[in-house]
């Protein structure tokens, strides 16, 4: 009798014993993973974070499509809505090079860097070349008309812009567009002035920054964040809150991200720091993420959301502020009138797209998303979709705006820039990190419930034994 | 080194004509327009005529319009104005100055035009 | 046309004093303001055109302010060849308009 009873408490402790490992493992497993990410999300040489962060292991691409306006001569002498048709898209490689002057400082425990730009064609991903033609805003016109709203100073624009046989708009190749082309009429400015134009000018041989984040070794909680940028923690753009420089550069977020969290990034593209909420979770390539949008409340106006009320930088374009959607950026572009907003005016009020026709907004194409894998914090896919527009208005002292009746906000382009972690990089994301930490909660569960039910089978039959040995 | 010289100042009745003459150095007037201004003795400066930039534009003084006329003849590099049914009150030192954005960086020397009988 | 009243039309100052002249445009003009200075028998010379930009060559003691309607040149601290007549003038619409002058005479 007792070799059984005694092999069935034995049962019953191993089975308690497995269970009680099983639940120790459960804090001490999270805390092994937690001083696991804690270390390799740390912004220093050795880490997996610091080697992917100097120099992405995804391809990143950015596909343009161009607003070929349809109707330039309609527009320009009856000031009738602009006709645009979207072609593309074009795709350039984007972001392959490595950061650049990476410094330390252990006083701050920050680490700078220069973020290099450069772009190459990839003809195969794109519809056209390089060397397609495009009817689009005369973007020198336009903006030195904003630029010189001085009656006198407008009459010499004129003659300028007449004797280069400029005009509203112009013919211009992509690469030209983008890229950068010496313009006929600023050309004839006998000062020297900048007389290359282009969407994009300069940008191959030029970098971003210099950045400043925090490298997280004196707390993970701040890894990737911004200190400052270009020297600075503000912008000098916007007035209050509006002008602070928040969070990271969307690349990476601190690790342990909560869905209820509000991620903060700073976009030096749309000279702001925004924000996304999570949406949904998502399965990419078997690493479970979650996925953050940027809601239509961020491009609000201050009367739908009082917190974009420093975002309204001027009450004419706006409406009083009471138009939203769109972005005017011309303090950060030196003057000249550029308005960012999301492709096809997505989330924009009609006022602002009732002058262009052509226009077809669809949240899933033009919204901007970023997956995030919430253990690590590091952005495993992204979409950042925007649309660079122009303002032109009327001026009776330039021939070439003389009959327009109306202010336009002139979609030039929109981008979709897309990354997307690589089959081999999620493999590895999957044995390093998802794979241990399953295998990690599956042992867990496995201990747990074997323990569980181990001592609850033995402790069953010991008291049936004991029972009937009693009677 | 960019000079202005005018010249073409002189006596000349009332109702008479005259023609004045800038001509520049140092830099093409057809890039910049040039001004006329001019000082009556012991008066303040008052502005007269203009010709924009690749001469795309003349405008006037209310005082001067419809008898004064500017011109420009860019291969001399010359710019003129030409002066008729002159008055009294037209008698002072006019000088041609280069202009792009509006204010005055060069200036002549001047030219005395004196309206007498 | 847009009328530039400039004051004081004189003022006696001496050598190392501070001299401010004003002038009032009669609308708004943004910052397209110039400043003369004219010496007896010579042309005018530029000191400053956007209202605060100070022309190449021009002694830094030379400044000016303003923008709108209301604008000011300010000597720092007067020397013997700064005695002469200021002018302004805007640039901001034909005609283009000049002060009336202020003449800037030892004491």
């Known amino acids: 009798g007792c070799d059984r009873n005694c092999g069935l408490i034995t049962g019953a402790v191993i089975g308690a014993v497995l269970a009680v490992f099983g639940g120790i493992l459960m804090p001490v497993g999270d805390m092994l993973i937690q001083k696991t990410i804690k270390k390799e999300v740390v912004l220093e040489e050795g880490t997996i974070a610091f080697k992917n962060w100097v120099k992405t292991g995804t391809e990143i691409y950015r596909q343009f499509w161009i607003f070929d306006v349809q109707n330039p001569q309609e527009v320009m002498m009856n000031s009738s809505n602009i006709q645009v048709k979207q072609r593309g898209p074009y795709t350039y490689r984007v972001r392959f090079l490595a950061k650049e002057n990476i410094t330390q400082d252990p006083k701050d425990n920050t680490v700078s860097f220069l973020q290099p730009n450069g772009a190459i064609f990839e003809p195969s991903l794109s519809v056209g070349t390089e060397a397609d033609n495009f009817t689009v805003l005369n973007l020198a016109v336009a903006a030195a008309s904003h630029i010189y709203p001085n009656p006198f100073v407008q009459v010499v624009l004129n003659s300028l812009i007449n004797k280069s046989k400029s005009s509203m708009f112009q013919v211009r190749t992509l690469r030209e567009l983008l890229w950068g082309y010496t313009d006929p009429f600023l050309s004839l400015v006998p000062y020297p002035v900048s007389t290359r134009v282009g969407m994009f000018y300069p940008y191959n041989n030029t970098a971003d920054g210099v950045y400043k984040v925090f490298n997280g070794k004196d707390s993970i909680s701040k890894v990737a964040i911004i200190d400052t940028y270009k020297g600075k923690r503000n912008l000098s753009y916007w007035e209050s809150y509006c002008d602070m420089i928040n969070g990271t550069d969307a690349a990476s977020f601190p690790p342990f991200v909560e869905k209820s969290q509000v991620l903060q990034f700073f976009s030096s593209d749309i000279c702001r720091s925004i924000y996304a909420v999570f949406e949904s979770d998502v399965n990419l390539k078997g690493i479970p993420v979650y996925r953050f949008v940027l809601p239509s409340k961020a491009f609000a106006s201050p009367v739908q959301n009082p917190d974009n009320h420093c975002f309204c930088t001027e009450k004419i374009i706006s409406k009083n502020c009471t138009s939203y959607g769109v972005l005017d950026i011309s303090k950060c572009k030196e003057g000249k009138p550029v308005y960012i907003s999301l492709p096809h005016f997505l989330y924009a009020s009609p006022d602002v797209s009732e002058t262009i026709d052509g226009l077809n907004p669809n949240e899933e194409e033009h919204r901007t998303y970023l997956d995030i894998e919430p253990i690590t914090g590091f952005t495993l896919q992204f979409a950042k979709r925007l649309q660079v527009n122009l303002l032109v208005k009327p001026s009776n002292k330039i021939q070439v705006l003389k009959r327009l009746k109306r202010n336009y906000i002139v979609p030039i382009l929109w981008l979709n820039e897309t990354g997307t972690i690589g089959d081999e990089k999620a493999k590895m994301f999957r044995s390093q990190v998802t794979g241990k930490i399953n295998l990690l909660g599956l042992i867990e569960m496995i201990l747990l419930s074997v323990g569980v039910v181990m001592f609850v089978a033995f402790m069953i039959s010991y008291c049936a034994c004991r029972s009937k040995t009693i009677k | 080194e960019v000079q202005l010289v005018e010249s073409g100042g002189g006596l000349v009745q009332p109702g008479g004509s005259l023609r004045l003459s800038c001509a520049a150095s140092g830099f093409t007037i057809d890039a910049f327009g040039i001004h006329w201004v001019r000082q009556a003795p012991g008066k303040g400066l008052e502005w007269v005529a203009w010709?924009?930039?690749?001469?795309?534009?003349?405008y006037y003084a209310d005082s001067v319009k419809g008898r004064f006329t500017i011109s420009a003849d860019t291969s001399k590099n010359t710019a003129y104005l030409q002066m008729n049914s002159l008055r009294a009150e037209d008698t002072a030192v006019y000088y041609c100055a280069r202009s792009f954005f509006g204010y005055f960086d060069y200036w002549g020397q001047g030219t005395l035009v004196t309206v007498s009988s | 046309d847009i009328q530039m009243t400039q004051s004081p039309s004189s003022l006696s100052a001496s050598v190392g004093d501070r001299v401010t002249i004003t002038c009032r445009a009669s609308?708004?003009?943004?910052?397209?303001v110039a400043w003369y200075q004219q010496k007896p028998g010579k042309a005018p010379k530029l000191l400053i055109s956007y209202a605060t930009s100070l022309y190449s060559g021009v002694p830094s003691r030379f400044s000016g302010s303003g923008s709108g309607t209301d604008f000011t040149l300010t000597i720092s601290s007067l020397q013997p060849e700064d005695f002469a007549t200021y002018y302004c003038?805007?640039?901001?619409?034909?005609?283009?308009?000049f002060g009336q002058g202020t003449k800037v005479e030892i004491k």
């Open positions: 609308q708004d003009v943004s910052n397209w």
């Open positions: 010709i924009a930039p690749y001469g795309g534009y003349t």
């Open positions: 003038q805007q640039h901001s619409n034909a005609p283009l308009t």
